[in-house]
Interface confidence: medium
């Protein structure tokens, strides 16, 4: 989890801190959304279950040239134990359903808030 602290944390951070910072970043994205996020780019929907961090990263990594989600992509990579590259897909993707990045972020945020409340930090 070393990279999860962004610029504020030079070394490894506790999972609870990492998850909170990810949530704060997603909140920030939804708050500051003036124009359509990432120009309305569509991404594969995912099942919000075990392994969802890698699945979320696999979806979002296919969005290029969108600075608004770059920090989120970096943070998600800290939660995913393996390297993720564009075009990679797991069974957690709902392959027949694409949604806008903005909706994807809102859905992910809602789920992460629930996990945080329940103390599921890993």
């Amino acid at each position: 989890l070393t990279c999860l602290g962004g610029f504020a944390s030079p070394g490894p951070v506790p999972p609870s801190t990492a998850l909170r910072e990810l949530i704060e970043e997603l909140v920030n994205i939804t708050q500051n959304q003036k124009a359509p996020l990432c120009n309305g780019s569509m991404v594969w929907s995912i099942n919000l279950t075990a392994g969802m961090y890698c699945a979320a990263l696999e979806s979002l990594i296919n969005v290029s040239g969108c600075s608004a989600i770059e920090k989120t992509q970096r943070m998600l990579s800290g939660f995913c134990p393996h390297k993720v590259s564009a075009g990679q897909f797991s069974s957690l993707h709902v392959r027949d359903t694409k949604i806008e990045v903005a909706q994807f972020v809102k859905d992910l945020l809602l789920h992460l808030k629930k996990l945080f409340r329940e103390g599921q930090f890993n």
């Epitope: 602290g5 962004g6 504020a8 944390s9 609870s16 801190t17 909170r20 910072e21 949530i23 704060e24 909140v27 920030n28 939804t30 708050q31 809602l110 808030k113 945080f116 409340r117």
Partner: antibody
Framework: EVQLVESGGGLVKPGGSLRLSCAAS????????MNWVRQAPGKGLEWVSY????????YYADSVKGRFTISRDNAKNSLYLQMNSLRAEDTAVYYC??????????????WGQGTMVTVSS | DIQMTQSPSSLSASVGDRVTITCRAS??????LGWYQQKPGKAPKRLIY???SLQSGVPSRFSGSGSGTEFTLTISSLQPEDFATYYC?????????FGPGTRVDIK
Amino acid sequence: EVQLVESGGGLVKPGGSLRLSCAASGFTFSSYSMNWVRQAPGKGLEWVSYISTSYNYIYYADSVKGRFTISRDNAKNSLYLQMNSLRAEDTAVYYCARDQVGATLDAFDIWGQGTMVTVSS
Amino acid sequence: DIQMTQSPSSLSASVGDRVTITCRASQGIGDDLGWYQQKPGKAPKRLIYAASSLQSGVPSRFSGSGSGTEFTLTISSLQPEDFATYYCLQHNSYPFTFGPGTRVDIK
């Protein structure tokens, strides 16, 4: 005991400045987002500003944007509100309030006792 | 901005009465809603968080329900110490907004 204690309130003339402080104790201050909330005499509650745990995310109510600045010093377990260009309508009791786990999650679980700010000539 | 409306604005009740206060949000806020009790000259005290979770130390006669846009605070059997003003708060998105409050006084 988990506690928040505000200070710095007082009487100030319109256009003047004031700096409020909120001292936190009994919990790991750096792990919590913080807010300022105010209440004008005889009125309801109004959220004023929010600051995240590591300073990166800050939000303000439109009514104070450009005039108030929220900040925190995690080393001193303290939250601040710098209030400039004060107006009569800023007269209120100012409370600091903790976010239970940050990032809008289960907000405002702990409140201070409040500090009164009066803006009058 | 999300607007919060509360009803009724005030009510008179007797000890032992069941009291219900409603809060409506102008758009969906999930369960990002809290209920607060405030007595004159005191800071607000949280009763309910996440729309329906009871704050530790708060008597079980208080309960919350709802999600999305409509929420309810219920006091199953009003006690003398419950006479106060009650506020709802949405913390789903900034600016956070409080309801205008419901004053509960003695009939």
